[in-house]
Each structure stands twice: as C-alpha cells, then as structure tokens.
C-alpha cells in the first residue's frame, strides 16, 4: 500500500540540538519562520541519521500540547486548539487563522525506540499584514540565502554594466526578468509553502494500527489533502523510517 507524505523541508532547514547525549539522530526543522496574521503556516520537523523507530510525535507551543501523532492510533488534536490546528502534512502540523498571540516557540518531540526523545525547535513570528508584505527583517534561512545570491548577481550585473555601457538596458532587463522567475520558483519550495504537486515520499511500511480515513488515498496536492482529511478524526500519521 502506498503512503504519501507531503514533506515541506528543503535546503533551508536547520538542525536542532538533541534532547540527550548518545543518540545519533538529528532533528531538522524549518527554523525561524514568519507568517502573516490571518494566514496559515506549516510546522515541519524531520528526524534523520538514525534507524530508530518513531513511535510518536508531540507538538507543543511553549508548555501547551497542540497535537499528538501516534504510530498506532493516528492524530489527536487538543480540543483547546481544534479550530485552528490541522494535522499534516506528514508528521507536521498546520496552524490556521494565525494571530499575533501565536508568535513564539514551537517544539516537535519525537519519541523513538530505542534512541529515546529528540526535540526540535521552531520560532514563529506572526506579522501584521503590512509588515509581512513589506518587511524582510525576519526571513527563513532559504530566503536569506536567496537574498545573498541576489546581491552577488546584482553586483556582477553592475560590474558588467560599467564595462559595457552600450548593452546596459538589454542586460538589466534580461537579468531582472530572470531573477523574478527564479524568486517565484524558490518561494514555492520555502518551508512555509506546500510542496509542489507530486512530491511524495512512499513510506517503507504502513504502521499496523492506523484508523484514518486516508488509507487508500493517492498522493494529492496539499489543498486536496486537507479537503479529504477530517482533521479531528484519527487520520494517519505517515510514520516511516526517517533516515537522512
């Protein structure tokens, strides 16, 4: 049976410190992220470099439980957050209808056997709409890297322009158009945006006791995934061996 897992992590992910000493695995998270008030955001962690079996993933906001994804039983969303938290994609969590009060630390806690517990940290800042649109002071690492790349390219452009003034207009037009296309393409892959259609990971083995309604689902786009998932039901947690 095929199990689809829409993974949102990419090159911008950060490694988080482990909860205890002798474990080999690492937790990668979406790091520091920002989102617009009223919007939604996907919190995603990924456990790699270990063959330990993931038995459960807990999501916490500061000291409050948001959700549990249990290998045997599926998802449990805390009633306190039921209206604004949706499970998935995968072992991640989607926060909806964000408010400024949602700003803060979020933790993914991976319970594994035999390693024990791994914890990842994500810091979310929810910005007022205007700030989110115009301010770039608090961007995820991927966008930071993108900005650095733009600076380098722009510098190169300026040098080229200085050397060959007569081709100035043509070159600037060409490069800027190309950069806009690159930028748009990169944003689709940012950790706070859905994976492109078709980017599925097939689980190595389906957990034995899952009770979700999604068992027979083929891989779908993110919006389809949420349309079919009754998010307070015991939807499947696509547990699989997460080795990197």
């Amino acid at each position: 049976m095929r199990w689809c897992l829409l993974l949102i992590w990419a090159q911008g992910l950060r490694q988080a410190p482990l909860a205890s000493g002798m474990m080999t695995g690492t937790i990668e998270t979406t790091g520091n992220i920002s989102a617009e008030k009223g919007g939604s955001i996907i919190l995603q962690c990924h456990l790699s470099s270990t063959t330990a079996q993931v038995t459960q993933v807990n999501w916490e906001q500061q000291d409050q439980l948001l959700a549990i994804c249990n290998a045997d039983l599926g998802w449990h969303i805390s009633p306190s957050f039921k209206d604004r938290v949706a499970p998935g994609p995968g072992l991640g969590l989607t926060l909806q209808s964000l408010t400024v009060n949602d700003t803060g630390e979020y933790f993914c806690i991976y319970h594994t056997y035999p390693d024990g517990t791994y914890t990842g940290r994500i810091f979310l800042e929810v910005l007022e709409s205007s700030v989110a649109e115009h301010g770039a002071r608090f961007q995820i690492p991927l966008l930071g890297a993108m900005a650095a790349t733009l600076v380098v390219i722009c510098t190169a452009v300026i040098v080229v322009v200085a050397l060959t003034r007569k081709k100035k207009a043509l070159r600037i037009h060409s490069v800027e158009g190309d950069l806009r296309r690159k930028s748009a393409g990169q944003e689709e892959w940012s950790p706070s945006a859905p994976s492109p259609p078709g980017s599925c990971v097939q689980a190595e083995a389906a957990p034995a006791g899952l009770c979700g309604e999604q068992r027979g689902e083929d891989c779908a786009e993110l919006h389809d995934y949420f349309n079919v998932l009754s998010y307070r039901s015991l939807g499947n947690c696509s547990f699989f061996t997460e080795t990197g």
């Epitope: 439980l65 549990i68 249990n70 009633p79 039901s233 015991l234």
Partner: antibody
Amino acid sequence: QVQLQQSGAELVRPGTSVKMSCKAAGYTFTNHWIGWVKQRPGHGLEWIGDIYPGGGYTNYNEKFKGKATLTADTSSSTAYMYLSSLTSEDSAIYYCARSYGYDLYAMDYWGQGTSVTVSS
Amino acid sequence: DIQMTQSPSSLSASLGERVSLTCRASQEISGYLSWLQQKPDGTIKRLIYAASTLGSGVPKRFSGSRSGSDYSLTISSLESEDFADYYCLQYDSYPFTFGAGTKLELK
C-alpha cells in the same frame, strides 16, 4: 481485553486527602488519555480532567483546579487522582475512562468506579 | 462551558417498545457526542460515539442521529437489559460536559 480496574471504596475525614488509582490492562497505557469523572446523586456526571501518560500532559476542569491532581505511573500502567482538603461535597463515585482522539477511542472504556465518602 | 440539555429526565416503556432520548448542545460540538449507559450497579458503557457510530459489541437496536444541535439515541425494540440510566457526553471542547441523564424504567 481492555480493562480499567479502580481502587476500593474510601471512607475519609473532612479536611484530609485521598488518592485513588485506575490500573489499565489490555492495551498500551502510554497511548491513551485517562479521564476522570465525578458522579454525585442529583448532580449527574462531571468531568474533572484527563492525563496523557505518554507525555505527562494534563487538562483540568477549572472547577476542580486545586482540588484534583492527576498523575500516572507508566511502569505499573496506573493512573492516579489525588483529592485534597476533602469536604462532604467531595463524597461521590469517581470513574476513570480511557480516550484518544475523537472517534473510535473517545471515552470508550470505563472503570467500575471508586466510592469516596467524606464523613466525621 | 457547553451545556447539554437532555430529555426526558425519566421514561417508562414496555419491552419491545421503541424509545428515543434527546440531547441539545448549547454550542456547536461538530458531532463529537457519545451516548453512555449506566447500569444499576454503576457500570458505565459507551454505546455510541461521534453522534451516530455504534460502539464495539453494542447491539444494533441502539442507534444515534443528529439534526443540527439536537442529538438522539434510539432503541428500536427494548429488551430487559436496556433499563438503565443514559447520558450524553460532548467531547468537542474542554471541559467535557454531560447531559443530566435519562432514567429508563420498565412500565
């Protein structure tokens, strides 16, 4: 099969405290929430709170904060409820029930109840 | 807190009769309602969950339904072991709350 075995009846003095237990069998104790419910004649059923042994998370009904404390011992698959500063209002039957999620496992199995009588 | 208004508070019926109990939620509970049966010895059993799904091992004469904020438990043909107390429970929001109960007695 799933069983929740509660401790025996208690007769206690006002102002004292009591600790009752709910021993789980037939399932993975750490996977399910254990909720506690109070029943007094003429007052129906009241939800006190719940605990998730797989993470130590607890939720309390505001009405019982400061009165009830929920704990769990995973090594013995037992959940406990501690009631403090007992008064006659605390005389009741207390039930434990297991739960997880909102469908199949929602409050699906119940203990037989522990009777607490507060009397001088 | 969400109030669950259960009716009737008591009901006398005969063997083989069809009976219905109702609970009304003061707020939206999204169908997250269970029906519980409590026998005279105090034993509690869940009959229905998610408003209309029959619990494991529960006889098919029990059924649950929903109409807006009204939730019903129907017993299609009463048997002797059905005479007991019945409670609805909403588990949509903390604190979970119960109806006041219906005492089903043999006429």
